[in-house]
Amino acid sequence: QAGPLPKPTLWAEPGSVISWGNSVTIWCQGTLEAREYRLDKEESPAPWDRQNPLEPKNKARFSIPSMTEDYAGRYRCYYRSPVGWSQPSDPLELVMTGAYSKPTLSALPSPLVTSGKSVTLLCQSRSPMDTFLLIKERAAHPLLHLRSEHGAQQHQAEFPMSPVTSVHGGTYRCFSSHGFSHYLLSHPSDPLELIVSGSLEDPRPSPTRSVSTAAGPEDQPLMPTGSVPHSGLRRHWE
């Protein structure tokens, strides 16, 4: 007797973080024996979508013409062959940005910092939120979460860095979110350029690459120091 059907591969183009109103295509790739593909969204009351395979039958396309809150979430796909349904794919997390107004990102005391000193990036939202994310451009592991304890709402989160090295230099943005759906993020803050001076080593430009690629040493998440900020937020690493 044959073993379970191999699981399909699930991915999104142009990516899994999509701005409100933009289009996204979800692809599910199975085998040439596939007769039907099914996309399931976590905690949905019914299959999210079902599609016939595209020739040569080894994949299916699920189109989202305009990204809205409805589509943000965690997906898996399956394919059906003559012997039954496959194992589920690994999950795909589809995140929508633009759900809330953009926060403000600033550097204290200044975005120009000397190597070895300390700097704190401050993400502030107009309305109280319970999750803040700091993202460094072109980092393989860009997300640093600060999430409030017990759902307490905050207007800001602090991301301290100490001691600063050339690795910390670069462009940052932050997002805010509500805990009831971490698949819905605010518009991104305006970019903040953190410039590290006085370093003996020349800062190397980080190569442009997608979030899914392996991390190099310059792409490690910022390691915060000291105690949890007074804002009542807890640190979570992605």
Partner: antibody
Framework: QVQLVESGGGVVQPGRSLRLSCAAS????????IHWVRQAPGKGLEWVAV????????YYADSVKGRFTISRDNSKNTLYLQMNSLRAEDTAVYYC???????????????WGQGTLVTVSS | DAVVTQESALTTSPGETVTLTCRSS?????????ANWVQEKPDHLFTGLIG???NRVPGVPARFSGSLIGDKAALTITGAQTEDEAIYFC?????????FGGGTKVTVL
């Protein structure tokens, strides 16, 4: 046109069993999920259970979990509800209602049957 | 267990706009509750109106629309007709089960 016809209702004593059927026509039964919903005399609607198009997923209301079983036979275009350990509070008109092909295509509870009355009484 | 609450009754006049709401005891109604609206006419004739991902059942007039207003789901009848007199039930999804509200009796005088 879409038709859902329930049958199998009647009077039954507490603790006994009953099996309801829902015969579907006018649409491709095997591509749709189907619900059971009930309405006690003079009351509102209470959702009972749903089964996906291929039977792969089944969900139940807490009030019937462990006592009722939803199933389907796609070759016969028929939905079933096996009701065991019946209680007086299960007395209601039981309706089957069509679910969706998928969430992005269709609306849950779009078509309903006329219902079959189940009375649980000693 | 979640309780879904609706207005017990609303009265409107032909041509007027009426909004029915659906509140969840667990907090704000969100898109993840997939709010659904069902109409009951006399003799227990049930028809789905709106649900899923903002879908309207084919054949349902465009004057019926669903939305989220504040922390509640809403059904708006824009330009009510006498034939819209009925009981309207909302249903909300909670991860693995549906819960119906108690229904709103709409009278069109």
């Amino acid at each position: 046109q879409v038709q859902l016809v329930e049958s199998g209702g009647g009077v039954v004593q507490p603790g006994r069993s009953l099996r309801l059927s829902c015969a579907a026509s006018g649409f491709t039964f095997s591509t749709y999920g189907i619900h059971w919903v009930r309405q006690a005399p003079g009351k509102g609607l209470e959702w009972v259970a749903v089964i996906w198009f291929d039977g792969s997923n089944k969900y139940y209301a807490d009030s019937v979990k462990g006592r009722f079983t939803i199933s389907r036979d796609n070759s016969k275009n028929t939905l079933y509800l096996q009701m065991n350990s019946l209680r007086a509070e299960d007395t209601a008109v039981y309706y089957c209602a069509r679910d969706v092909i998928s969430m992005v295509r269709g609306v849950p509870f779009d078509y309903w049957g006329q219902g079959t009355l189940v009375t649980v009484s000693s | 267990d979640a309780v879904v609450t609706q207005e017990s009754a609303l009265t409107t006049s032909p041509g007027e706009t009426v909004t029915l709401t659906c509140r969840s005891s667990t907090g704000a109604v969100t898109t993840s509750n997939y709010a659904n609206w069902v109409q009951e006419k006399p003799d227990h004739l049930f028809t789905g109106l709106i649900g899923g991902i903002n879908n309207r059942v084919p054949g349902v007039p465009a004057r019926f629309s669903g939305s989220l207003i504040g922390d509640k789901a809403a059904l708006t009848i824009t330009g009510a007709q006498t034939e819209d007199e009925a009981i309207y039930f909302c249903a909300l999804w909670y991860s693995n089960h549906w819960v119906f509200g108690g229904g709103t009796k709409v009278t069109v005088l």
